[in-house]
């Protein structure tokens, strides 16, 4: 809860002008939902639905709220202390190695494989070999059985804030 974000924690493009060194870890910091004024004297509220800050900080600006892409649904809106939480629409998923877009889930498993996991907002359907029980690589098969996946279950967000 008492974590803090300072200018140095931000990516270069998010950093504001350098600030004087603080004499203690929490001196001159503003609460979540706020940023510090340029003279370092006041705390200014983030704008509801526009920007946010999640920790005690000495940021000169709040962080801009994420906008959900088309193909995503908004699970929870941006508040002054929490970024928007977006999730892939039903029938699509986001992989860890390609987080920039939602991909369509496969409609079924290749011949000789059975479905053991449904399409969820964060994973494709899961297929295993009937005999060996080993998982399929996840490539879209050339030939598909008529095993279809059930709708994705509501679940964890794909875009979480700290």
């Amino acid at each position: 809860e008492s974590a803090l974000i300072t200018q140095q924690d931000l990516a270069p493009q998010q950093r504001a002008a350098p600030q004087q060194k603080r004499s203690s870890p929490s001196e001159g910091l503003c609460p979540p939902g706020h940023h510090i004024s340029e003279d370092g004297r006041d705390c200014i509220s983030c704008k509801y639905g526009q920007d946010y800050s999640t920790h005690w900080n000495d940021l000169l600006f709040c962080l801009r709220c994420t906008r959900c892409d088309s193909g995503e649904v908004e699970l929870s809106p941006c508040t002054t202390t929490r970024n928007t939480v977006c999730q892939c629409e039903e029938g699509t998923f986001r992989e860890e190695d390609s987080p920039e877009m939602c991909r369509k889930c496969r409609t079924g498993c290749p011949r000789g494989m059975v479905k053991v996991g449904d399409c969820t907002p964060w994973s494709d359907i899961e297929c295993v070999h009937k005999e060996s029980g080993t998982k399929h690589s996840g490539e879209v098969p050339a030939v598909e059985e008529t095993v279809t996946s059930s709708p994705g279950t509501p679940a964890s967000p794909c875009s979480l804030s700290g």
Epitope: E1, S2, L4, P25, S26, E27, L29, P31, P32, G33, H34, S37, D42, C43, I44, S45, K47, Y48, W56, T79, T80, T81
Partner: antibody, heavy 119, light 107 residues
Framework: QVQLVQSGAEVKKPGASVKVSCKAS????????LHWVRQAPGQGLEWMGW????????KYNEKFKDRVTITADKSTSTVYMELSSLRSEDTAVYYC????????????WGQGTLVTVSS | DIQMTQSPSFLSASVGDRVTITCRAS??????VAWYQQKPGKAPKLLIY???TRHTGVPDRFSGSGSGTDFTLTISSLQPEDIATYYC?????????FGGGTKLEIK
């Protein structure tokens, strides 16, 4: 349930100091910011400053900065406000109030402590 | 510091009346305004925050609106228990400041 229980009324002479306490219960002490707000008789409300037990952050209203000291005892979940060099215009009801670590509005208030400054 | 100017400072109305209290900020405060109700000898109680969000347990006859510099608290149908003094507060920039109050009485 959330409770902020303040110390009793005080009568002080001009130039003296007063220390008012506010004991918090019914919630996690380190998750909320505690504030002091005062109200002179028949007057409006005036924010004096805050203390955040989670990181010991303190912020004062510049108007009171030279005379007010806010401290806390985490072992008893109590916050203190000491006001020095008292003058007659400091006669007021002093409230502690809390707010979540977010927008600066106050969702729970103590019952208030009347401080009278009179020679 | 931001000045919050409330009007009227005194208001007399009948039970069932629609009552409107206004608050003007000396500079843009976005929607960072809260409203409180205070009864004699008691601490203030939070009614509205973010200009229009009702606090938990507040009757829906209380509503708030506004953004920028002009804000309104409305009681759609005044009840005897609503007799109190009402304060606006800006929570946009420290020092957080309050309006001078509007004392509401029953005609």
């Amino acid at each position: 349930q959330v409770q902020l229980v303040q110390s009793g009324a005080e009568v002080k002479k001009p130039g003296a100091s007063v220390k008012v306490s506010c004991k918090a219960s019914g919630y996690t002490f380190t998750e909320y910011i505690l504030h002091w707000v005062r109200q002179a008789p028949g007057q409006g409300l005036e924010w004096m400053g805050w203390f955040y037990p989670g990181n010991n952050n303190i912020k004062y209203n510049e108007k009171f900065k030279d005379r007010v000291t806010i401290t806390a005892d985490k072992s008893t979940s109590t916050v203190y406000m000491e006001l020095s060099s008292l003058r007659s215009e400091d006669t007021a009801v002093y409230y502690c109030a809390r707010h979540e670590q977010g927008p600066g509005y106050f969702d729970y208030w103590g019952q208030g402590t009347l401080v009278t400054v009179s020679s | 510091d931001i000045q919050m100017t409330q009007s009227p400072s005194f208001l007399s109305a009948s039970v069932g009346d629609r009552v409107t209290i206004t608050c003007r900020a000396s500079q843009d405060v976005n929607t960072a305004v809260a409203w409180y109700q205070q009864k004699p000898g008691k601490a203030p109680k939070l009614l509205i925050y973010w200009a229009s969000t009702r606090h938990t347990g507040v009757p829906d006859r209380f509503s708030g609106s506004g953004s920028g510099t002009d804000f309104t608290l409305t009681i759609s149908s005044l009840q005897p228990e609503d007799i109190a003094t009402y304060y606006c507060q800006q929570h946009y920039i420290t020092p957080w400041t309050f309006g001078g109050g509007t004392k509401l009485e029953i005609k």
